[in-house]
Interface confidence: low
Amino acid sequence: VPRWRQQWSGPGTTKRFPETVLARCVKYTEIHPEMRHVDCQSVWDAFKGAFISKHPCNITEEDYQPLMKLGTQTVPCNKILLWSRIKDLAHQFTQVQRDMFTLEDTLLGYLADDLTWCGEFNTSKINYQSCPDWRKDCSNNPVSVFWKTVSRRFAEAACDVVHVMLNGSRSKIFDKNSTFGSVEVHNLQPEKVQTLEAWVIHGGREDSRDLCQDPTIKELESIISKRNIQFSCKNIYRPDKFLQCVKNPEDSSCTSEI
């Protein structure tokens, strides 16, 4: 008789999740000399310990503390790029602009990027069939709590000018319910962060509107200003050209507005 298993609304744990996490850890620590001391076995043990045998709707930030401790990493606090709903371009940017970092350029972000995971209460099994959906099932699920934890720590570490890339093609360019809007914005430290600079990425080639005047951007400006952090905003009308100019800043066509 097959054992009864909780059916959740979201997709199950990513296939070969343990191996993927460990392979990524080994790869990351090989590529980043400053993280060579990290023992990937310990990292996996801590990652697993955060959710295995625990109810997948009852995960806390505390569960992830051993993993956070092992993954402690110093990135230049004035070179942080946050993003919301435009991950691919943000990652393309930091691949070119190597001195800037998204969360996924850190060890912990790199380990978990695009993965799903959850366990089951009182068993050591990983649930490959289904995992809780943030909206339909519960918010305190292993994946959501992980990203909330690492995002909070990433934002807390930021200083000077912090950049955020926002998707100008979405109805809510700034979404208070996104990780950026609900976690990162509120964890920037006013005593360390001078300015939050938003880069609004345009989607249409002919779109010449000033999306920095969008009501949601004004809402972001208000939230940031109330936290005693300055706010600035730039339109990136041509993201393709923007990336090209980051690669080749001397190009004559890059001196004009992008």
Epitope: P18, C25, V26, D39
Partner: antibody
Framework: EVQLLESGGGLVQPGGSLRLSCAAS????????MSWVRQAPGKGLEWVSD????????HYVDSVKGQFTISRDNSKNTLYLQMNSLRAEDTAVYYC????????????????WGQGTLVTVSS | QSVLTQPPSASGTPGQRVTISCSGS????????VSWYQQLPGTAPKLLIY???QRPSGVPDRFSGSKSGTSASLAISGLRSEDEADYYC???????????FGGGTKLTVL
């Protein structure tokens, strides 16, 4: 509870072959790298070979390269050591040991051991 | 000849503190973690210390590990008669792409 049970040892003539097995239970076998470690009578421990979680990586001590083959069947939760061209100096208790989840060299240690199986090579 | 060097024997009286050394090179202890195992007579080895100084659950805090450069040490405080056993250090050797053990130290409780 993690359990490792070795079998397949015995008396064999020089030049002969044996296949050792290690049946694993109490953990997700295909999450872990596995090793064979041997101990000659009255001597110390000697690492023999290890294999990664999926069998994709294998390593051997120089003295058994080309002679021993480590393998695993994750569907059967079993580790194997095929030993050919056996010599008197291969006489030892052979232990199966659970290593790390991914063959991460810097953290490689043996958290669990079987009770061992004795291989005697003698004419 | 073992890659890691341990004294063949050590001894102490009950209640004493005993230290067992393990010497290696940059390609093993210098670059990688050290583990320690206890082997009671007629039994399989048991993990005592891993990652230089970590104790698995169930191992008394009388056992402690440390490492400096290319050498490691296992300390046993409050020595007991049941500690009489063989003790082995182990590390990974990057140049050999495999694990290496010390020759073992026979601990006698007098």
């Amino acid at each position: 509870e993690v359990q490792l049970l070795e079998s397949g040892g015995g008396l064999v003539q020089p030049g002969g072959s044996l296949r050792l097995s290690c049946a694993a239970s109490g953990f997700t076998f295909d999450d872990y790298g596995m090793s064979w470690v041997r101990q000659a009578p009255g001597k110390g421990l000697e690492w023999v070979s290890d294999i990664s979680w999926n069998g994709g990586k294998t390593h051997y001590v120089d003295s058994v390269k080309g002679q021993f083959t480590i393998s695993r069947d994750n569907s059967k939760n079993t580790l194997y050591l095929q030993m050919n061209s056996l010599r008197a100096e291969d006489t030892a208790v052979y232990y199966c040991a659970r290593g790390s989840l991914f063959h991460d060299s810097s953290g490689f240690y043996f958290g669990h051991w079987g009770q061992g199986t004795l291989v005697t090579v003698s004419s | 000849q073992s890659v890691l060097t341990q004294p063949p024997s050590a001894s102490g009286t009950p209640g004493q503190r005993v230290t067992i050394s393990c010497s290696g090179s940059s390609s093993n202890i210098g670059d990688n973690y050290v583990s320690w195992y206890q082997q009671l007579p007629g039994t399989a080895p048991k993990l005592l210390i891993y990652r230089d100084s970590q104790r698995p659950s169930g191992v008394p805090d009388r056992f402690s590990g440390s490492k400096s450069g290319t050498s490691a040490s296992l300390a046993i405080s409050g020595l007991r008669s049941e500690d009489e056993a063989d003790y082995y250090c182990q590390s990974y050797d990057s140049s050999l792409s495999g694990s290496v053990f010390g020759g073992g130290t026979k601990l006698t409780v007098l």
